[in-house]
Interface confidence: low
Amino acid sequence: KIDACKRGDVTVKPSHVILLGSTVNITCSLKPRQGCFHYSRRNKLILYKFDRRINFHHGHSLNSQVTGLPLGTTLFVCKLACINSDEIQICGAEIFVGVAPEQPQNLSCIQKGEQGTVACTWERGRDTHLYTEYTLQLSGPKNLTWQKQCKDIYCDYLDFGINLTPESPESNFTAKVTAVNSLGSSSSLPSTFTFLDIVRPLPPWDIRIKFQKASVSRCTLYWRDEGLVLLNRLRYRPSNSRLWNMVNVTKAKGRHDLLDLKPFTEYEFQISSKLHLYKGSWSDWSESLRAQTPEEEPTGMLDVWYMKRHIDYSRQQISLFWKNLSVSEARGKILHYQVTLQELTGGKAMTQNITGHTSWTTVIPRTGNWAVAVSAANSKGSSLPTRINIMNLCEAGLLAPRQVSANSEGMDNILVTWQPPRKDPSAVQEYVVEWRELHPGGDTQVPLNWLRSRPYNVSALISENIKSYICYEIRVYALSGDQGGCSSILGNSKHKAPLSGPHINAITEEKGSILISWNSIPVQEQMGCLLHYRIYWKERDSNSQPQLCEIPYRVSQNSHPINSLQPRVTYVLWMTALTAAGESSHGNEREFCLQGKAN
């Protein structure tokens, strides 16, 4: 009933709660002397379903058979309509349409840790649309049964708040869940288990690692576990890897030796536990332990290259360069590099430790045979030294690689190709391709890059430290014993027309011709490798086409003579620069009048 129903009653048969698809009979009847005031046969009883009229009848009572009610709650209200007055509410009723509960499925119980409590979950099946109460029962030894009720709307989990203990680990317990509502009840299939079946250990904790004598080969992992744990599984991986190494251990008692760890590597370790070989479930993985393994002495050898530069008749500058060892070769933090320079005939040797750099420059006499050895040292020792005899890398013309070319290969790559030298190609032991940014004046501080190529290769793709719109000086060396030959070329990965033309800084007169001098275009404005300069000139006030002179680009050149100017005529001169992509805009304009005598 939804109000006091003073004027009449609404009755529902067979029940206010019905099965989906059932029919109900609803009766609305007026109490004595509650009809219309003047003439009771004018009573008009109207039945509403929510706000919609579904039936009416003149008299003291109304009967209505209702079918097809939807799942959920439907409100029926009976009203009285008298002539010349508003409808008066008599009474009402709610009808609840639902279904009997389905059998709960997949009942499973778990106890998290030896000190945890038993909790069970199940699948309810389809919604009953009615108030449904779930009762969970657990029957165990000594004829004891625990039971707990759940009155949530959607109940599919209950924690008993009881703790199963391992006194009799083989004792059976049986769980069952029963769902009850007004239309029926249904019970799950019973689930029978022992302590060992349902206890899921807590993950191990307090994980530590120890390295005996600071050695990666003598490593022990320690952890703490719950008392009944029989099995453990360990997983570990380098922190930068996605793949785990797995180890299963029995009766480990909280320790295990690991034999295959790499030195100077940060690892992540996790452990899981289980109480029984084939019963129960594995714990969650423990929290990760992250630890770095100790260093070991470096393996591998440094890749060393060098440059020679003539200083004067008696001295030469040697610049040594080397590449960092890979992480797996360094096996620790490289503290310094040891460079030894030795004159082979006289036996004089000089050793120096280099920190923070992968290059070293020194000045040595041009006479004598010199060799260098370079090794890398960490806290545990040094790598094997790389030994190189210093020679004139380009001395043997017959060893010079032929037809060297450099072509752009996609973004920031240059493909260098060559033909073997004319001298017996089988004599070549290896090729070295070297590249550095082209800087006018041959700045020795510009970083040097190189790669080694097998003697049967005739191409190399260079991509390291290659930037767009920068010109690189590329050399290909062919090495054979103590001899070397080289060829060079300029190349870029991407080019466009230079952003500016050369700046003419001086024009001087020499014996009836002029010498034009200019400043190089800044490297960042060259936009690739320059191929030519052009010098333009025309008479000052003339509209005629300018004349021009095209000069092949050479790194060191910054002046050029012109001898086709007429004396005592004022000319305007300017310059441009060209790459393979096109011509720059004009540089500055200069006026000049040749003073020499006319022919």
């Epitope: 759940c150 009155k151 949530d152 709307i153 959607y154 109940c155 599919d156 989990y157």
Partner: nanobody, 123 residues
Framework: QVQLQESGGGLVQAGGSLSLSCAAS????????MGWYRQAPGKQRELVAA???????IYHDSVKGRFTISRDNADSTVWLQMNSLKPDDTAVYYC?????????????????WGKGTQVTVSS
């Protein structure tokens, strides 16, 4: 102990809007879920919308697209913006909160409840 105080209920015409607000006080700093339930006369209490501290939102199908729940974790406050209201939305609206995260809690068994605020939508 956590106290929940609702405000913002009232009478509104169908198609109109209302905004409900609920502020938690007491030991509210560890509340995970905060949400709104409603109970119309003679009906079971039903979840309308809920939100957890990570910003996950849950809505009853009947209000999806019309109601928006939002939350200020720092102030332990939750709001329910109700647009395009219908007469079916008439009910007492309860604010509820819980430190746990289980679905059954969400569905009706939350630990903390407000006293409720009446929302009436007239046609």
């Amino acid at each position: 102990q956590v106290q929940l105080q609702e405000s913002g209920g009232g009478l509104v015409q169908a198609g109109g809007s209302l905004s409900l607000s609920c502020a938690a006080s007491g030991s509210a700093f560890r509340l995970n879920f905060m949400g709104w339930y409603r109970q119309a006369p003679g009906k079971q209490r039903e979840l309308v919308a809920a939100i957890n501290s990570g910003g996950t939102e849950i809505y009853h199908d009947s209000v999806k697209g019309r109601f928006t729940i939002s939350r200020d974790n720092a102030d332990s406050t939750v709001w329910l913006q109700m647009n395009s209201l219908k007469p079916d939305d008439t009910a007492v609206y309860y604010c509820a909160a819980d430190r746990g995260i289980s679905w059954s809690k969400l569905a009706g068994g939350m630990d903390y409840w407000g006293k409720g605020t009446q929302v009436t939508v007239s046609s």
